[in-house]
Interface confidence: low
């Protein structure tokens, strides 16, 4: 039934960067300035989105695909397509609701974006904290006294802590 | 510390699709873009496109859009490069780089893999 | 998309000499350029960032400058480790676009 119904219909035969226009019989029209559809069949094209204030322009909106946003120095992009922009702080500290705040003791953060983790908990892993954690960098765990032999790696650094999430390239 | 292995030299015949490696080790593998660029004999370099690992998220020159294909394994951290029908066009030198965030720079590049396409 | 252009492909110069290598956009990238060293064995190392910012573990003789679309590299005590190509890249807009180039050779 669907493909029948698409071959009735002559909206299906117009291509991505165009719609069917119901007002010239329904003919195919280009999408008019600062607009785009990114799909055949469309009956109205979508209005591109503005890159502005805080977000700059990482792709120009082209009459098949939308524009895409990051965000100027100073700040990195949340959520999905960039759709907010928060505020960096140095690398040993977190945004808060006050603005950017130093980590607590016990803490650090070795990016600008992100919230303060915990140090790594060395004795845990039944290691010795061979280099103390700052407010930017985790600690170094090293073998317990046990382990150091002849040949032996002194140095296990942990994992760093990075947020995933996605970030415009 | 980072580092972006690439194997020295691959040969291919034209026409035969092929992928070429970058493994990744020093650094939390998908918190970094990976970037492809290009560099035919004696010439400049050229951006092919790159890849978030996290989501595999891609961007690519339209230039190239037909040509490379960018994909990621995360468990081995490693990101590889699909050339689609390769000609002698495409014989060159090809350095993967990584890019941190937004318009930062390509901090650390790969030795690059010298690949030959002939018959 | 933005072209990047090094008016000089190649350039000679004595040790000890002060270098400065161009570099121009087709428009304004905001400062967003970035500079590269590629040794003759194909090697390729970030010196700086950011117009002006030095990438760690690079030698304080190398330093950057300019706005707008015009940008330069200056190295001010050319020592033989030096000898490499340098590119400029533009980091404001997709696609990233590189200059052709700048050989730098010993007289």
């Known amino acids: 039934f669907e493909r029948t119904r698409s071959l009735q219909d002559p909206c299906s035969n117009c291509p991505a960067g165009t719609f069917c226009d119901n007002n010239r019989n329904q003919i195919c029209s280009p999408c008019p300035p600062n607009s785009f559809s990114s799909a055949g069949g469309q009956r109205t094209c979508d209005i591109c989105r503005q890159c502005k204030g805080v977000f700059r322009t990482r792709k120009e909106c082209s009459s098949t695909s939308n524009a895409e946003c990051d965000c100027t120095p100073g700040f990195h992009c949340l959520g999905a397509g960039c759709s907010m922009c928060e505020q960096d702080c140095k690398q040993g500290q977190e945004l808060t609701k006050k603005g950017c705040k130093d980590c607590c003791f016990g803490t650090f953060n070795d990016q600008k974006r992100g919230i303060c983790r915990p140090w790594t908990n060395c004795s845990l892993d039944g290691k010795s904290v061979l280099v103390n954690g700052t407010k930017e960098r985790d600690v170094v765990c090293g073998p317990s006294p046990a382990d150091l032999s002849p040949g032996a790696s002194s140095v296990t650094p942990p994992a760093p802590a990075r947020e995933p999430g996605h970030s415009p390239q | 510390q980072v580092q972006l292995q690439q194997p020295g030299a691959e040969l291919v015949r034209p026409g035969a699709s092929m992928k070429l490696s970058c493994k990744a080790s020093g650094y939390t593998f998908t918190s970094y873009w990976i970037n492809w660029v290009k560099q035919r004999p004696g010439q400049g370099l050229e951006w092919i496109g790159n890849?978030?690992?996290?989501?595999?998220?891609?961007n690519y020159n339209q230039k190239f859009k037909d040509k490379a294909t960018l994909t990621v394994d995360k468990s081995s951290s490693t990101a590889y490069m699909q050339l689609s029908s390769p000609t002698s066009e495409d014989s060159a030198v090809y350095y993967c780089?990584?890019?941190?965030?937004?318009?930062?720079?390509?901090?650390?590049w790969g030795q690059g893999t010298t690949l030959t396409v002939s018959s | 998309d933005i072209q990047m252009t090094q008016t000089t492909s190649s350039l000679s110069a004595s040790l000890g000499d002060r270098v400065t290598i161009s570099c121009r956009a087709s428009?304004?990238?905001?400062?967003?350029l970035n500079w590269y060293q590629q040794k003759p064995d194909g090697t390729v190392k970030l010196l700086i960032y950011h117009t002006s910012r030095l990438h760690s573990g690079v030698p304080p003789r190398f330093s950057g400058s300019g706005s707008g679309t015009n940008y330069s590299l200056t190295i001010s005590n050319l020592e033989q480790e030096d000898i490499a190509t340098y590119f400029c890249?533009?980091?404001?807009?997709?696609?990233?676009?590189f200059g052709g180039g700048t050989k730098l050779e010993i007289k």
């Open positions: 780089t990584r890019l941190y965030y937004g318009s930062s720079p390509f901090d650390y």
């Open positions: 428009q304004d990238i905001s400062n967003y």
């Open positions: 890849i978030y690992p996290s989501d595999s998220y891609t």
């Open positions: 890249q533009q980091g404001h807009t997709l696609p990233r676009t």
